[in-house]
């Protein structure tokens, strides 16, 4: 029995209900009192959501998963999983029982963007050329983590002198803090390039140092 | 009919290895899933292995995982066991058996059975 | 140690009925189905109910089943003298990803 399912992840982000794809060919004459199907977790085996006796058995899985009970008779077996959480992330595996077996597993990958970057300086007054100071940028509740690029006004990456922690919530989203420490010339723009590498979402934030006083784009 | 007829039984010593054979007859072998189960002397039943109706899904109870293979040729209409590093709890009846509708195994051979004794 | 448990012995008198007991867990019975097969003195297993309760042709209405959350039963009515054999539960285990067996029952016809 063929199971086939997405071989890309399933991309879902915090919160927003997920459809994890499965389908199977009924052959001619297929009933619904034929089938049984389990859900699991593909690692731990942890039991998900199953379908027999010709009737759903229900979620095992914090009550957050549904069939799709008008397409099973058609081959469809995919899985709802609703209000998505960081701790959903892994493989689930579909296995299909009717007269012969057969299984596969879907991947998915959770994602939550990062908010717009906070910019912060230290020391934030009287700063002269050739004064040494930090510069913090601070995103917040994204998944997963994230790639932190700084540049100048002219583009030019800054690499040397820069910390990045990053930190989980207990939803599991990360908070970033973004470190430069920048010895400052006449006038500069410093920005910081916050990237979610599975949406591929860009959050941007610069600073602008003039002399005095300073701007905060 | 449909019938199952297993092969390839014997008497045998620790650590050696034997091939059990399943023929089967009397229906559209390629299309189902089948099974091994075996049961000790005077012991209940153990299911050992499954097989779908290709190949490409196959589970081992953990007590052969690793030492027994499961594995069929529908041109032969034959599913086949291949049994390594025997030990003497392996010692039983090997019952081949067709998949059915819920999990069920609605045909079973008459057996053959292994002895593995030093 | 059976994942399905089964009490080890049963007993009737010709006539009678006897009820046979199978308790599982929330990932074997109770997420998928349960069958039973019946072991006559030196023969192979046969199968006598699948899915809970549905018989396969020629098996006698005398045998019904049942199944109730994560527990199963097998009823035998106007118990008969050639129904003295070994009667197995078994479920397909979802979290163990195994067909799993009860340890079986002998019963006995008095």
């Known amino acids: 029995l063929e199971v086939q399912v997405p071989e890309d992840p399933v991309v879902a982000l915090v919160g927003t209900d997920a459809t994890l794809c499965c389908s199977f060919s009924p052959e001619p004459g297929f009933s619904l009192a034929q089938l049984n199907l389990i859900w699991q977790l593909t690692d731990t085996k942890q039991l998900v959501h199953s379908f027999a006796e010709g009737q759903d058995q229900g979620s095992a899985y914090a009550n957050r998963t549904a069939l799709f009970p008008d397409l099973l008779a058609q081959g469809n077996a995919s899985l709802r999983l609703q209000r998505v959480r960081v701790a959903d992330e892994g493989s689930f595996t579909c296995f299909v029982s009717i007269r012969d077996f057969g299984s596969a597993a879907v991947s998915l990958q959770v994602a939550a963007p990062y908010s717009k970057p906070s910019m912060t300086l230290e020391p934030n007054k009287d700063l002269r050329p050739g004064d040494t100071v930090t510069i913090t940028c601070s995103s917040y509740r994204g998944y997963p983590e994230a790639e932190v690029f700084w540049q100048d006004g002219q583009g030019v990456p800054l690499t040397g002198n820069v910390t990045t922690s990053q930190m989980a919530n207990e939803q599991g989203l990360f908070d970033v803090h973004s470190v430069l420490r920048v010895v400052l010339g006449a006038n500069g723009t410093y920005s910081c390039l916050v990237r979610n590498p599975v949406l591929q979402q860009d959050a941007h934030g610069s600073v602008t140092i003039t002399g005095q006083p300073m701007t905060f784009p | 009919e449909v019938q199952l007829l297993e092969s390839g039984g014997g008497l045998l010593q620790p650590g050696g290895s034997l091939r059990l054979s399943c023929a089967a007859s009397?229906?559209?072998?390629?299309?189902?899933?089948m099974h091994w189960v075996r049961q000790a002397p005077g012991k209940g039943l153990e299911w050992v292995a499954a097989i779908n109706s290709d190949g490409s899904r196959i589970y081992y109870a953990d007590s052969v995982e690793g030492r027994f293979t499961i594995s069929r040729d529908n041109s032969k209409n034959t599913l086949y066991l291949q049994m390594n590093s025997l030990r003497a709890e392996d010692t039983a009846v090997y019952y081949c058996?067709?998949?059915?509708?819920?999990?069920?195994?609605?045909?079973w051979g008459q057996g053959t059975t292994v002895t593995v004794s030093s | 140690q059976s994942v399905l448990t089964q009490p080890p012995s049963a007993s009737g008198t010709p006539g009678q009925r006897v009820t046979i007991s199978c308790s599982g867990s929330r990932s074997d019975i109770g997420a998928t189905t349960v069958n039973w097969y019946q072991q006559l003195p030196g023969t192979a297993p046969k199968l006598l109910i699948y899915?809970?309760?549905l018989r396969p042709s020629g098996v006698p209405d005398r045998f019904s089943g049942s199944k109730s959350g994560t527990s199963a039963s097998l009823a035998i009515s106007g118990l008969q003298s050639e129904d003295e054999a070994d009667y197995y539960c078994?479920?397909?285990?979802?979290?163990?990803?195994?067909?799993?067996f009860g340890g079986g029952t002998k019963l006995t016809v008095l």
């Open positions: 078994a479920s397909w285990d979802a979290s163990l990803n195994t067909w799993v």
């Open positions: 009397g229906f559209s072998f390629s299309s189902y899933g």
């Open positions: 899915q809970s309760h």
């Open positions: 058996t067709k998949y059915y509708y819920h999990y069920a195994m609605d045909v």
